[in-house]
């Protein structure tokens, strides 16, 4: 049943009449709850298998969470007249495994998109750009939330998941205006090197709870607006001089590095020196060594160069099996 809390005076929704006449612009779809005063439509936990066709034109905030959408085809939200006011679209936890090219076309005001908690076996390179042109029309997106979109191992395509996501982020340079990008909990082993260069407006980047081992090939240099960089709960062992210098050069950034398995050997010396003088790292007094065993739980800020040694590498003839 439709729960319409809209103050509009339109006739109640009748499923049998839906195909007989075009939908009224302010009615509420079946299985949804609508508030025209809040410009919000919620179709939540209803096991919907497709996007309702009869969304009211006033909608600015659309929740389609907890459904069973499976596939988001091209033009999934294209309507005539278009949903010109739709600004925030939440599709999290709706069992999406495929988002096709142009899925979000004809949404001229779409500024926030949340696809979190969907096992995306296929994310089209043109999901956000809408076209395969080398430079496409700028997307209006300002915030893109893609937490925990990694599919189970048996549903993965042959190509790397990191590469698939990166291709969608850089296609057509459409996301040049993106301010916020969340990519937490995606089992990322690496960050493709060209991604951040195509996202120069980023203010907030969340890469927490991944499996990033190194940032050696990642450049933050052009992210001059970056305010928050979340790298907690990864597999980082050390940050090298190039990365440290780039982070220090960003004028507004705060970096979060908790819960990484820092290796406190001779390669850590530069990072410890940097940590002691930088204001960039939030909660830097909480960072502790994980390896080697003798250094476990030592606080990085309390280390000095004498603590950070590397075991000499034995020549092959002296190594034992």
């Amino acid at each position: 049943t439709s729960s319409a809390s809209s103050s509009s005076s339109s006739a109640p929704f009748l499923a049998s009449a839906a195909s007989a006449q075009p939908p009224l612009p302010d009615q509420c779809p079946a299985l949804c709850e609508c508030s025209e005063a809040a410009r919000t439509v919620k179709c939540v936990n209803r096991n919907l298998t497709e996007v309702p066709t009869d969304l009211p034109l006033y909608v600015r905030n659309l929740f389609l969470t907890g459904n069973q959408l499976a596939v988001l085809p091209a033009g999934a939200f294209a309507r005539r007249p278009p949903l010109a006011e739709l600004a925030a679209l939440n599709l999290s936890g709706s069992r999406l495994d495929e988002v096709r090219g142009g899925a979000f076309e004809h949404l001229p005001s779409l500024r926030q998109l949340d696809l979190s908690h969907n096992p995306l076996a296929y994310l089209s390179p043109f999901a956000f750009s809408g076209s395969n042109a080398s430079i496409s029309a700028p997307s209006p997106l300002v915030e893109l939330i893609l937490n925990h979109i990694v599919p189970p191992d048996d549903k993965r395509q042959n190509r790397s998941f990191e590469g698939m996501v990166a291709a969608a982020l850089v296609a057509g340079r459409a996301l040049q205006g993106l301010h916020l990008l969340e990519l937490a909990s995606n089992h990322f082993l690496y960050l493709p090197r060209d991604v951040l260069a195509q996202l120069p407006s980023l203010r907030y980047l969340d890469l927490s709870n991944n499996s990033l081992v190194s940032l050696t090939y990642v450049s933050f240099r052009n992210l001059t607006h970056l305010e928050s960089l979340h790298l907690e709960d990864n597999a980082l062992k050390v940050l090298h001089n190039g990365t440290l210098a780039e982070l220090q050069g960003l004028p507004h950034v705060r970096v979060f590095l908790d819960n990484n398995p820092w290796v406190c050997d001779c390669h850590m010396a530069d990072m410890v020196t940097w940590l002691k003088q930088t204001g960039v790292v939030q909660g830097k007094d909480r960072l502790t060594c994980a390896f080697p065993e003798k250094m476990r739980n030592r606080v990085l800020l309390e280390l000095n160069s004498a603590d950070l040694d590397c075991d000499p590498i034995l020549p092959p003839s002296l190594q034992t099996s």
Epitope: S5, S6, S7, E33, S35, E36, A37, A38, R39, T40, K42, R60, N61, E85, A87, A88, N90, R111, Q112, V142, E143, I145, H179, L180, R203, Y204
Partner: antibody, heavy 122, light 107 residues
Amino acid sequence: QVQLQQWGAGLLKPSETLSLTCAVYGGSFSGYYWTWIRQPPGKGLEWIGEIDHSESTNYNPSLKSRVTISVDTSKNQFSLKLSSVTAADTAVYYCAGWFGELYHYYYGMDVWGQGTTVTVSS
Amino acid sequence: EIVLTQSPATLSLSPGERATLSCRASQSVSSYLAWYQQKPGQAPRLLIYDASNRATGIPARFSGSGSGTDFTLTISSLEPEDFAVYYCQQRSNWPLTFGGGTKVEIK
């Protein structure tokens, strides 16, 4: 950070038209619902009406026949006119803005003007 | 229009005590309910939006709960600056409406 500054005549005679303007500084019009609210002396808050960036208006039915809210996007201002005032319209009038889109950074942001005391007396 | 009824009208408590304020709607407002704090001579300040979300900069001692018709604002441990009037407001239907307010005063 968005800030609001409001101004207008504070003393009116019965049957005159109340006119207040609110200027928006430090942010964009888009995404906000620009609102007027009033508070009679010693009483609670009453919603007068609102306008959004597309100039769509909604008014309190109890005041609708007398109220006009308009916006001038070129000046980043919005205005309230209330005609045929009586002593019952004596109140502190507030302009306010509510960010009603689900942005991480801004959703739930709520800004208010300093309030203008309007007295209607013959 | 949707009528919001707040109770009690006045709550007399001491600093450090827990305050529980109620707001009841005449019909469902889903989760589209906000709580405001107002001190004498000042504009109201948003505390809670969408029934349970704390606004930016609001201390964790303020929490909101409820949906449909019954809502609660809880102040876990009153600080001296918390003594004020609190209003609920619904944004489910036009006209937007406020409750009559609850005054939290020092016992």
